[in-house]
Structures are given as C-alpha cells and as structure tokens.
C-alpha cells in the first residue's frame, strides 16, 4: 500500500494532465483528489502513466467507490482496465455497449479472459438479457466471448438473436452451453430448407439429442468429422454403422484417423465388427461376430 503523506503546495493537482507522469507514487497518492480523477477519467488514457502509477490511480478510485465504480468512470478506464480483477468488475453495473466496446478493445492482446468474461456477465445482467445488439457487439469485438457466459446467462438469449451468431463464436463453447443454445437455434432455423438448415444448425449440434442426430442422418447432410466429434457422446453411441455412414457421407473415412479419440473410440467399441468392416477403413475393436450383447441395465430394471 502507498504510504500517506501530505501534498507539497507546488505539487497540488487541479487537473489531470501530462505533468502527472513526473509524480512519484507517493506524490500521486497525496496530491490527486479522487473526485477530480473520477471527473476527468477521459483524460487518463491519453497520458503515458507507468503501471505503478496506474496502481495508485486505481487505489484512489477504489477508495472513492468501495461499492464499485459508476459507469461514467468505467467507460473511460482505458488502460486502467488492465489493472482490474474479476472481483473488482463483479461490483460494476454496466448497461452501455459503448462501455463494453471500449474495454474489449483495451483488453485485446492481454491475458484477460477472466476479466472479460466477468465484464460480459455484468453487461448481460445490466441489460436484463442477451439481446441482439449485445451479441452483435460480442461477435464484432470479441469472437469466442459468447462462450465465456454461463449456461444460465445464455438462457436469456431470445431465439431471434441466434441468427447473428457465427460458427467461430461457438468454437470454445462447452457441452452445457450448447445444450442451452441448440434448442434455441432449432427454433430459430426451423423454417429453412434441408441444406440451408444444416449449414446454420451445424455449429450448435454439440447440444443435439440422439433423435435429432438420427433425423439428420436421413437427410444427406455429409457432416464433417469435426462437427461429428463435437456431438454429445450420449447422442453418438446409439447410432448404427449405417446411420453414421449416412450422416458423415464422404467424411466417414476420417473415422480411421480419429479412432483413438472420443466419441469415435467409444462408438467403435459398441458396433459389431462385421458392420464396421463395411466401412472399408480397417477399423478394429468392434464386437466380434457371434457374440451376444446383453444390456444389463434392462435386466436390472426388470428385477
């Protein structure tokens, strides 16, 4: 912490300007009035403060706003945002997309994924839902950031907004997030024709249930392997060899090079070796011919 001293009269600060870069840490602490700093935050980013000096300025704002900064200050944080922790950001109430854009720009190229995720969360809370303007801002200024939101936050996305989401925005989404987004996407694209529907729904398929995957296998969609491997394991395991062949079309030969990865590996183990042989890939590990498959879960349910 910065030690308290009194400000020498000749060092008194009446406005935030470039002269402050020559102030030592303790002089900044003693001479800069927190209210003045807050009122003139828009000037701070134009001044080449050192990281140590920025620490002092942050400390002053923290003292002035212990419950969290007002948006008028947040909007003009500039490089001071780099000093914020997720705990700091959690106290904020942000509703303006201009604020979001400004801070996303500042964070680019810095390791700030936790801070950015918290900021986006605060924006969604502040605006009440993940509306189209927010999604557009995220896709433009922070590709992939959509996936930093929790499934609970994503549940506030109206289906009408799903069309604004691009495939690359979903690259880092996990299964729980796709579970939330997939039904919305299905609803949003339901009036599209077969091939157009598949192109649109493809990035969301990691949240699709088995019955929807089986339905796709009847539609000549030629699903690529990367999409197939993002499907839920539970959605893939019940598929037959014939269904997977129909689903993947020409991409089915790629099963050979990905046979060690889930869900491909787990699926192979559940297929009859005879059926796997029809794929012409030399896949091994299926159930040998002549073996009976006992589903013990059914027997337990009956007893």
């Amino acid at each position: 912490d910065v030690e308290r001293t009194t400000c020498p009269p000749e060092k008194e600060v009446h406005e935030i300007d470039e002269s402050l870069i020559f102030y030592k840490k303790r002089e900044l602490e003693a001479c800069v009035d927190a209210a003045l700093l807050a009122a003139q935050m828009d000037r701070v980013d134009a001044i080449p403060f050192t990281y140590e000096q920025l620490d002092v300025l942050k400390h002053k704002l923290d003292e002035l706003y212990p419950q969290g900064y007002p948006e008028s200050v947040i909007r003009h944080l500039g490089h001071l945002f780099l000093k914020m922790s997720p705990e700091d950001i959690r106290k904020w109430n942000v509703t303006s997309l201009e604020t979001l854009k400004a801070l996303l720009k500042v964070s680019k190229g810095h390791e700030m994924s936790a801070q950015v995720a918290t900021l986006i969360d605060r924006v969604v809370v502040g605006r009440g839902q993940l509306d189209k303007d927010t999604v557009d801002t995220l896709t433009a200024f922070c590709p992939g950031c959509l996936c930093s939101l929790s499934p609970e936050r994503l549940s506030s996305v109206p289906p009408s907004v799903i069309g604004a989401v691009r495939p690359q925005d979903l690259d880092t989404c996990g299964p729980r997030q796709l579970d939330v987004l997939y039904p919305k996407a299905r609803l949003a694209f339901q009036n599209m024709s077969g091939s157009e529907y598949f192109v649109k729904i493809r990035p969301f398929l990691g949240g699709a249930p088995t019955e929807d995957v089986k339905a796709l296998s009847q539609q000549n969609v030629s699903m690529d392997l990367a999409t197939f491997m993002k499907l839920r394991r539970e959605a893939v395991l019940p598929l037959t060899v014939a269904e997977v062949q129909k689903l993947l079309g020409p991409h089915v030969e790629g099963l050979k090079v990905e046979e060690q990865h889930s869900p491909v590996r787990d699926w192979i183990l559940k297929q009859r070796q005879d059926d796997l042989d029809t794929l012409g890939l030399g896949l091994q590990g299926g159930i040998p011919n002549g073996y009976l498959i006992l589903d013990l879960s059914v027997r337990e349910a009956l007893s």
Epitope: D224, M229, K230, H251, G280, L281
Partner: antibody, heavy 117, light 113 residues
Framework: QVQLQQPGTELVKPGASVKLSCKAS????????MHWVKQRPGQGLEWIGN????????YYNERFMSKAKMTVDKSSSTAYMQLSSLTSEDSAVYYC??????????WGPGTLVTVSA | DIVMTQSPSSLAMSVGQKVTMSCKSS????????????LAWYQQKPGQSPTLLVY???TRESGVPDRFIGGGSGTDFTLTISSVQAEDLADYFC?????????FGGGTNLEIK
C-alpha cells in the same frame, strides 16, 4: 509396397465416354478408400470424389456429379472412373490416389486424357 | 466450398537457403476435439504425380526428409524447407480435408537458382 497402376494416355472424341482404370496392389484393397483428382495442364488440382472399395459407396464433388462415375471391382482390386459427354475442358491428367485416412497417401502415375476430334 | 490460397505463386532459391511458403484457408481446419488440423502438403516434381509430404498440418509422412517442416493451425499454415536441395525443385500444393469438396491451393512453384 503400395502400387497404383494407371494407363498412360487415352485419346477420345468430343461427346464420347472413357473409362479410366486404377489397379491397386501391395495392400488390402477393401481397407482404404480411393480418391480421384483432376489436373489440367499447367493448372492446379481438383478433387473429383472418393469411393469405399468395401461397399462401393461413392461420393462426388458437385462439379463432377454429372461428369464422373466411380466404381470398383473387388475381385481384381481395381478402381474405375467413367467420364461421359467429353469436351476439351475434360482434357487433363486424372490421378487415382489411395487414402491415408483423409489425406492422399499414395498417388497413381495418372492418365492423360486428350479430347480431340 | 473452403477456399485455399497459397503464396507466393513462385519463388527462386539457392541451395542451402531456407524457404517458407504459406497456405491460408477461408475457414478453420482445426478439429477442436482432437486438436488435429485437417491440412496436407504435397510435392509434385516436373512430369511426376504428387507425393504426400505432411498431414495434420505438421506430421511428416514417413520417408520424407526432416528438412520439410509443416506448421500453423486454424486458418494459417506454412511449409518450410530448412535447407533447400536441388531435388526440391517442384510445385507444392496444400489441401484441406476438413469438409468436402476437398480443395487444393493453387500451388507454389519452387525454382532453384
């Protein structure tokens, strides 16, 4: 070792058809898919399609859907591609290539098809 | 279709020099589950058929000299020849096998000075 044999040249008349062959040896024919690729003189490579020699299922680049038909004869370990309604645009070298999983691990020497009256 | 763009279209190098050529795809070729990039590099010497050099963007095919090094991920890929030899005179093609129709780049022609 893996070998793919293709005839060197085929001279055909405009409007006619030609059936190109690719005889495989040195590996289990039904364990690897076969691809066909077109290369026009001094130009790049174009993927025509792939075929599963085990089942005969074939898949095409849409651009070649009405131009090419791929088949296999398991008994002779040979892949075929028939090209129909030939024009000067079809004059090119046609390669068969054995898959390595997705990439093309072994290529035949290619057949030069010349369409000329 | 996925568009593959190679650069430069040609280059001339002296024996022993290091050469790097680029291949860019119009969309990602990364399988985020297996972390494999579905990109291959081929060499085509004058009057011959292409041969596989590299698959999965960076895995060298067996028998390929270790001066051939594939790199990159997502949409940007490179093939580097660490010390060019006279026998490397050829066209070099990249190909995506992420989604059909599998597409090739226009090629880079390597001349030896």
């Amino acid at each position: 070792q893996v070998q793919l044999q293709q005839p060197g040249t085929e001279l055909v008349k405009p409007g006619a058809s030609v059936k190109l062959s690719c005889k495989a040896s040195g590996y289990t024919f039904t364990n690897y898919w076969m691809h066909w690729v077109k290369q026009r003189p001094g130009q790049g490579l174009e993927w025509i399609g792939n075929i599963n020699p085990s089942s005969g299922d074939s898949y095409y680049n849409e651009r070649f859907m009405s131009k090419a038909k791929m088949t296999v004869d398991k008994s002779s370990s040979t892949a075929y591609m028939q090209l129909s309604s030939l024009t000067s645009e079809d004059s090119a070298v046609y390669y068969c290539a054995r898959s390595g999983g997705l990439w093309l691990a072994f290529w035949g020497p290619g057949t030069l098809v010349t369409v000329s009256a | 279709d996925i568009v593959m763009t190679q650069s430069p279209s040609s280059l001339a190098m002296s024996v022993g020099q290091k050469v790097t050529m680029s291949c860019k795809s119009s969309q990602t070729l990364l399988n985020s589950v297996s972390q494999n990039n579905y990109l291959a590099w081929y060499q085509q010497k004058p009057g011959q058929s292409p041969t596989l050099l590299v698959y999965f963007a960076s895995t060298r095919e067996s028998g390929v000299p270790d001066r051939f090094i594939g790199g990159g991920s997502g949409t940007d890929f490179t093939l580097t020849i660490s010390s060019v030899q006279a026998e490397d005179l050829a066209d070099y093609f990249c190909q995506q096998h992420y989604r059909t129709p599998y597409t090739f780049g226009g090629g880079t022609n390597l001349e030896i000075k």
